[in-house]
């Protein structure tokens, strides 16, 4: 992470993407340590904007405003040089979010993908954004940036992610920026969880009292495996959300979760997946599909006693 020979390394914590009102620490790492340093903001003229102030270890900026967005550099203290200061550091871009209406983020073909596949994340808005930025939660690298394409009063950008592997799973958000203010970003899109399946052994899925039930009869779907999964996810074909439950160790050394579906009203095809707490967005292979059939008088919906997860939240730990 060190800079070149006489070049400090400027970094931001916790992130270079900071919401309005948030705080960020700028750290200038120079010659195996944090020495005194000066900060510059590249606003046309390359002059210290901090009134010649000298900082030690880090400079905390905040509550940040749109004016804080931009490119920063630092110079480390070099007492025995001609100028007393090092060469300028790497440029560090600080992006301030929350300045325009949020864009929308969609996954094509969908947010549940097999390892090795490619997904297109489309960020779009009716605000005429010049650039779109895609950011994965928990990643300190700068967001990916694309120029927005404008068609029929909508600006959009397609981010291609893949081939998918565990490190690319997670919660994504996108932002937009308007011309002349490239680092003053919009509010974030609603979060979108990208889940990668097919990494571990498939669990088995069964129905109690059985896969064919009378209308009104209570049905429970059990997902189990010899693998020590922490969480099981149950999905129903044609439904956008999944249900999840904590796995419980059983006396026969399997790990199981029982999903009560309540009184049967109509059937459907179900699948379940297992995942580990450490990697909540990386799932097992799908169980074999289980077709639940209801005999009698079907109605249009099946109540959900287990609370469905929202479009996002899959990649959060289940506490």
């Amino acid at each position: 992470l060190m800079g070149g020979q006489d070049k400090p390394f400027l970094s931001a914590r916790p992130s270079t993407v900071v919401p309005r009102g948030g705080h960020v620490a700028l750290q200038c790492h120079y010659r195996r340590g944090f020495n005194n340093f000066m900060l510059y903001k590249e606003d046309r003229s390359h002059v210290p904007i901090f009134h010649g102030r000298i900082f030690q270890e880090s400079f905390i900026m905040g509550p940040v405003t749109p004016a804080h967005a931009g490119t920063y550099r630092c110079r480390g203290s070099r007492p025995h040089s001609l100028t007393g200061w090092s060469a300028p550091s790497n440029p560090l871009v600080i992006m301030v979010t929350g300045n325009h209406r949020k864009p929308s983020l969609l996954a094509h073909p969908g947010p549940l993908l097999k390892s090795g596949e490619t997904v297109i994340l489309q960020c779009w808005s009716d605000v005429m954004f010049e650039h779109f930025f895609l950011h994965r939660e928990g990643i300190s690298e700068d967001p990916s940036r694309l120029v927005g394409q404008i068609h029929d009063g909508v600006s959009k950008a397609n981010f291609s992610i893949g081939p998918l592997m565990p490190v690319l799973a997670g919660t994504y958000r996108c932002y937009g920026s308007v011309p002349h203010s490239p680092y003053q970003l919009s509010a974030p899109s609603d979060p979108l969880d990208i889940v990668i399946t097919g990494l571990y052994e498939k669990p088995s899925l069964s129905a109690q009292p059985g896969p064919t039930v009378q209308a009104g009869e209570n049905v429970t779907l059990s997902c189990s495996s010899w693998s020590s999964y922490d969480i099981y996810h149950l999905s129903r074909e044609g439904e956008a959300h999944e249900r999840r439950l904590r796995a419980v160790p059983k006396v026969n050394r399997t790990f199981q979760a029982d999903f009560p579906l309540g009184p049967a009203t109509h059937g459907g095809t179900y699948r379940c997946f297992g995942s580990f707490r450490a990697l909540p967005c990386v799932w097992s292979n799908s169980s074999d599909p289980l077709l639940v059939s209801v005999t009698g008088n079907p109605s249009s919906s099946w109540p959900s006693p287990t609370e469905p997860s929202s479009k996002s939240g899959i990649c959060r730990h289940l506490h």
Epitope: R20, G22, H23, P63, T65, T97, P191
Partner: antibody, heavy 120, light 107 residues
Framework: QVQLQQSGAEVKKPGASVKMSCKAS????????MHWVRQAPGQGLEWIGY????????ENNRKFKDKTTLTADTSTSTAYMELSSLRSEDTAVYYC?????????????WGQGTTLTVSS | DIQMTQSPSSLSASVGDRVTITCRAS??????LAWYQQKQGKAPQLLVY???NLADGVPSRFSGSGSGTQYTLTINSLQPEDFATYYC?????????FGGGTKLEIK
Amino acid sequence: QVQLQQSGAEVKKPGASVKMSCKASGYTFTSYTMHWVRQAPGQGLEWIGYINPSSGYTENNRKFKDKTTLTADTSTSTAYMELSSLRSEDTAVYYCARLGKGLLPPFDYWGQGTTLTVSS
Amino acid sequence: DIQMTQSPSSLSASVGDRVTITCRASENIYSNLAWYQQKQGKAPQLLVYAATNLADGVPSRFSGSGSGTQYTLTINSLQPEDFATYYCQHFWGTPYTFGGGTKLEIK
């Protein structure tokens, strides 16, 4: 020691305006942002907005954007909040609070609160 | 805007008990979280900042933990003066929203 002294209780009629104050002492007024928080009777706390007394920069919770005006007088180390077009729903205790320093700062000092009653 | 979900909304306990209050953020707030105690008719008082740091003068029976989206305030060995309402608040971008509060009552 740090103190935030707020102005006294106010009773106003619907449609009127009110300007409450928060006088800071015991620290450099321009080095910290001043925030305002409201608490309706029997309810929780709501962040209204803040002012940076050094620059005059203000930011408001969207919910209160057309309701509040935040100002500061650096010569007297006093922050002000004006509430306009008062309605009975604005009846609440209003607190000023100083945002501390550091990377993860909290509201480290609070005023004692100004009670506003809006009634016809 | 970031939502803060605090639970439980009320809690009955006895002197000497250990109680836990949780606060869940709708997104990662990077430990930008404070806990406050408020007694009837008084201004809130800071207990914990940066999720885990105890404010000056706060008794060591109070402790904060958590990271990411999930945070906890724990009070060990409740004292009579601890019966009050507790609020969490995030600082990761405006608006700095508060949790709904937890009223801690004597059993």
